[in-house]
């Protein structure tokens, strides 16, 4: 099953994907597509790289902001909308027949968080919270935690795009979160 990542409307979403160039610097083409990985290539391509750089992007909202030359081909989608929700395919196109590495990741875009109790802080999920939930039978995957994270207890309902923040004990440092006073 694909791993799920959460982002809030209007913020940036981060979908991780990486490989280890062998030897170092020996890059391979990568494509990102909207929809689960198909048998061949990527369908509905949103971004494509060649052996040197990004050479195709369907929108200026799609970026590779990691160290591309070290194999970090994680996709950043800027200013996400509900329409960006869904499964994305990261396909690492290793030379040879049927050698490609295929990774399906699911982006869940939620409406701006409702916060209780008042007064409240409303923040974006994009990089403030651990972004990974897992589905399937293999247990939780390693949580992505860029920067310093606040100590937050949260519940994300599968059915209601609502986030409730019960405690907030740390300042938001280096997390890219936006603080807005209600």
């Amino acid at each position: 099953s694909e791993v799920e990542y959460i982002a809030e409307v209007g913020q940036n979403a981060y979908l991780p994907c990486s490989y280890t160039p062998a030897p170092p610097g020996n890059l391979v083409p990568v494509c990102w597509g909207k929809g689960a990985c198909p048998v061949f290539d990527c369908s509905n391509v949103v971004l494509r790289t060649d052996n040197r750089d990004v050479n195709d992007r369907t929108s200026g909202r799609y970026w590779l902001k990691g160290d591309f030359h070290k194999g970090d081909v994680s996709l950043t989608i800027e200013n996400v909308t509900l329409a960006d929700s869904g499964v994305y395919c990261c396909r690492i196109q290793i030379p040879g027949i049927m050698n490609d590495e295929k990774h399906n990741v699911k982006l869940v875009v939620i409406k701006p968080a409702k916060v209780t109790p008042a007064p409240t802080l409303q923040r974006d999920l994009t990089s403030a919270f651990p972004r990974m939930l897992t589905t399937g039978e293999h247990g939780p995957a390693e949580t992505q935690t860029p920067g310093s994270l606040p100590d937050v207890n949260l519940t994300v309902s599968n059915f209601f795009c609502e986030l409730q923040i019960f405690t907030l004990t740390n300042e938001l440092r280096d997390s890219g979160a936006t603080i807005r006073t209600a």
Epitope: G35, A36, C37, P38, V39, F40, D41, V87, I97
Partner: antibody, heavy 116, light 107 residues
């Protein structure tokens, strides 16, 4: 208008060879994946082979591996399927189509009959 | 390989009626499903890809839905030219496979 036209089908004896051609027009042939699909009488469609233009990667269904070879000639905007060691079960209408995962458009097809 | 099963094998309908064709995959193919229409003596024609996206030039009366293992092609109001053979095709798993087809015939 995007168009694909197959040729080269016919009657051949078991163990024989045949080369199918597909002439493409109306699009930049060299940038697309191209595919062969066949349909045996009364049977469902069967994906046979495809080729990744540029990279040159070629993929085949198991039943034709080692016997069929897919290729292109970008100068002629043409797709080919070289079929060797033909068997009775290869009898079908062979279609060329544009695309890797879903196919649009398709040619009108060419009939290959393998019989003694 | 993934087995695609279409039902019914034959569907008898009248022009103007709503037709619903089903396709089931033996395991999940996500949204990687296409539908084709084929008329006698002609090549297949792409109708739908990505389970629900209409191909270029396909009338709005054709719609696709479903995800995972269950898919549906709906023709909202049948026209005389819609009576044909319809195939589904998955493109998640190797090798690409097609359903056996549903024949839509005039009642």
């Amino acid at each position: 208008e995007v168009q694909l036209v197959e040729s080269g089908g016919g009657l051949v004896q078991p163990g024989g060879s045949l080369r199918l051609s597909c002439a493409a027009s109306g699009f930049t042939f060299s940038t697309y994946w191209m595919t062969w699909v066949r349909q045996a009488p009364g049977k469902r469609l069967e994906w046979v082979a495809n080729i990744k233009q540029g990279g040159g990667d070629k993929y085949y269904v198991d039943s034709v591996k080692g016997r069929f070879t897919i290729s292109t000639d970008n100068a002629k905007n043409s797709l080919y399927l070289q079929m060797n060691s033909l068997r009775a079960e290869d009898t079908a209408v062979y279609y060329c189509a544009r695309g890797s995962n879903w196919f649009d458009p398709w040619g009108q097809g060419t009939l290959v009959t393998v019989s003694s | 390989e993934i087995v695609m099963t279409q039902s019914p094998a034959t569907l008898s309908m009248s022009p103007g009626e709503r037709a619903t064709l089903s396709c089931r995959a033996s395991q999940s193919v996500y949204d990687n499903l296409a539908w084709y229409q084929q008329k006698p003596g002609q090549a297949p024609r792409l109708l739908i890809y990505g389970a629900s996206t209409r191909a270029t030039g396909i009338p709005a009366r054709f719609s696709g839905s479903g995800s995972g293992t269950e898919f549906t092609l709906t023709i909202s109001s049948l026209q005389s030219e819609d009576f044909a053979l319809y195939y589904c095709q998955q493109y998640t798993h190797w090798p690409i496979t097609f359903g056996q087809g549903t024949r839509l015939e005039i009642k």
